[in-house]
Every structure is written in C-alpha cells, then in structure tokens.
Amino acid sequence: HTAAQDNCTCPTNKMTVCSPDGPGGRCQCRALGSGMAVDCSTLTSKCLLLKARMSAPKNARTLVRPSEHALVDNDGLYDPDCDPEGRFKARQCNQTSVCWCVNSVGVRRTDKGDLSLRCDELVRTHHILIDLRHRPTAGAFNHSDLDAELRRLFRERYRLHPKFVAAVHYEQPTIQIELRQNTSQKAAGDVDIGDAAYYFERDIKGESLFQGRGGLDLRVRGEPLQVERTLIYYLDEIPPKFSMKRLTA
C-alpha cells in the first residue's frame, strides 16, 4: 500500500483519469479524450487539455502595441488533433473536411481550406502578449510590486522559467505580460509559454485546471487584483498567411 494509492490524482491536471496501476503501485494518469499519458509533475500541453475539454460534458467557459502579424484566438474551442508528444498537429480539420494550419498554441494561422491544404511544419509561437484590464481600485498598483507578483506567479504556479517572462508593463488599468521563448531557448523539461499562458487564461476565468487547488487569488501587497478583461496575442516565428480579403474585413 503506497502513498500513490491513497491519493491517486494528477495535481497539475484535473481533466485526467488516474489509477494506481503503474510500476510498484504508482499512480498513472491519462488525459480525458485522448487517453494519453500525462506527466503530473508539470503542465499538460494545451492540445491535450483542449481535447479533454471537448470530451467533457458541455456545461462549464509603457504598453506594447501588438504587431501587425499578431494572432488572436477568434475561432474558440475545437477538438484538436495532437501528435504522440501531445503537441498540436500542424494541420487541423473538422468533421466536414474543412482544414486549416495552426501554430504551436493551436491558433489558426491560415485561411480555411479543404483536405488538400498542406501545412508543412508546426510553426512556433515565440512571443505571447497577455493583455489584462483590472477592475477599478482605490489607486494604481505599484509597478515593481505588480511585476514581482506576476513573475512569482508564473514561476511558482506554472513552473515557467523566469527568463521566459520578458516584461510586465502597466498603465492603469491595463497590465501586459510578455512571454518570449524561441525554439533554441527551450530546453528539455522547460514549460512551454503557450501552455503557461493557457493555464493562466483558465485561472483568470475561474476555470482552474489544477486538481483540488483553490482558484487563483492574485494579490499585490495584500490588495486583490481582479481581472475584468483578457486578450491574448500570439506572435509566430514565421508570420501567418491570410488572404487580403480577411485582412481588410
């Protein structure tokens, strides 16, 4: 009888099925929807989380100017195809054979096409800009306190290496968090900025993915930081390919 058998759950992902049937009675967890093995010592990939979400009962959902190539996830939820490592496959298709190419965070980066559409490689999202507006407070937050608290959050809650939090900007009531992570910078075992941003987004919406942990209670010097709007911009290592028709719409 082991500790694993007493508490066979996945601390970092509640969208899992776990059983103490691993080697030596260890707890083994698989993602809902895909059945893929999940490493419960780190964040689960966004692709597996989206797949799990789509399989679950449908009841629960100095400032930087984003570059002209920045993508916003306007398409919402879809049931993605994930590769054996849990990453998004470069080409995604729906049940009606409409296909499109996505980046490493699963956001569409081309016009939609048919089954003949080719997506040669999974293009990496290397820069994520999280744009938040906080609820009115008595006064502005101290910028350096806010910066320190958000960096601590990404380091401790999401296990993102501090070097990938490039900057925190603040002009009341807007907060911007910049995450940067090039392919060459990401070592084995490093949390992906796309996964960290997705966990943060779900936390902010009150839909925490962590097992049994309380929701996100963000405080700066004891003062609650309550977010009323979130926008996330994704910048890829290769600019997206949309037709002019979409760009002028």
């Epitope: 500790a3 080697p23 030596g24 260890r26 083994q28 967890c29 093995a37 490493d39 419960c40 490592e85």
Partner: nanobody, 121 residues
C-alpha cells in the same frame, strides 16, 4: 530528437517465446528509465515492464510476472523484452517508451512506433 525503434515481433504459437529489442537514440539512454507498453486491438495502452536507468530495479504487472523479463544494455543503447510462455491475450502492439518514476507517479513521455506480437495457433 528522441528516437525509439522496436524489432523482434511476429507470429508465435501459444506457449512460445519472443525477444523484442528497442534501439534508442537522441537522448542519454544510460540515465533514462525505460518501459515496455502494449496496446491490444480496441484496448487502451498498458505497461508490461519497467526498468530503471542502471538496470537494478524492475517492475511487472501481475498479468506478465514470471513470464516476461526486461533488460538493457547501456553500452549498446538497447532495451530488451524476453517473453516466454506466451498466451493469446498477449497479442498486441508492443512499444518501448522512455519513462519517469517518482515517489507517487509514473509516466511515459516518448514511445516508439511499435512491433506487433500475435499469439495464435
């Protein structure tokens, strides 16, 4: 990148034996825990053996204990699975996997394409 290539599968009669091999590359094999995982048609994957990095510790589920033996040759970057007294229910796709064992949890993070083992008379 991590590459795992299995070989040695095939058709065998009940009671027979097979030895599977897995050639590993793209990561420090001698410091990695490894497992064999199988998936029968229409079923979910299940681990059938585990070995730690230096080969000093192995685990087997009750379904294969006493029949299967996992071993490794770190000088050749190769993992093995000796399967004896095979049964029809051992029919599955067998894949080697890089594994991780903590005090409480077990997970595989990379898998090979697999080699098919069919036990039939």
């Amino acid at each position: 990148q991590v590459q795992l290539q299995e070989s040695g599968g095939g058709l065998v009669q009940p009671g027979g034996s097979l030895r599977l091999s897995c050639a590993a590359s793209g990561f420090p094999f001698s410091s990695a825990d490894m497992s064999w995982v199988r998936q029968a048609p229409g079923k979910g994957p299940e681990w059938v053996s585990y070995i730690n990095a230096d080969g000093s510790k192995t685990y087997y589920p009750d379904t294969v204990k006493g029949r299967f033996t996992i071993s490794r040759d770190n000088s050749k970057n190769t993992l093995y699975l000796q399967m004896n007294n095979l049964r029809a229910e051992d029919t599955a796709l067998y894949r080697c996997a890089r594994a991780k064992l903590t005090d409480t949890h077990y997970v595989e993070d990379y898998w090979g394409q697999g080699t098919m083992v069919t036990v039939s008379s």
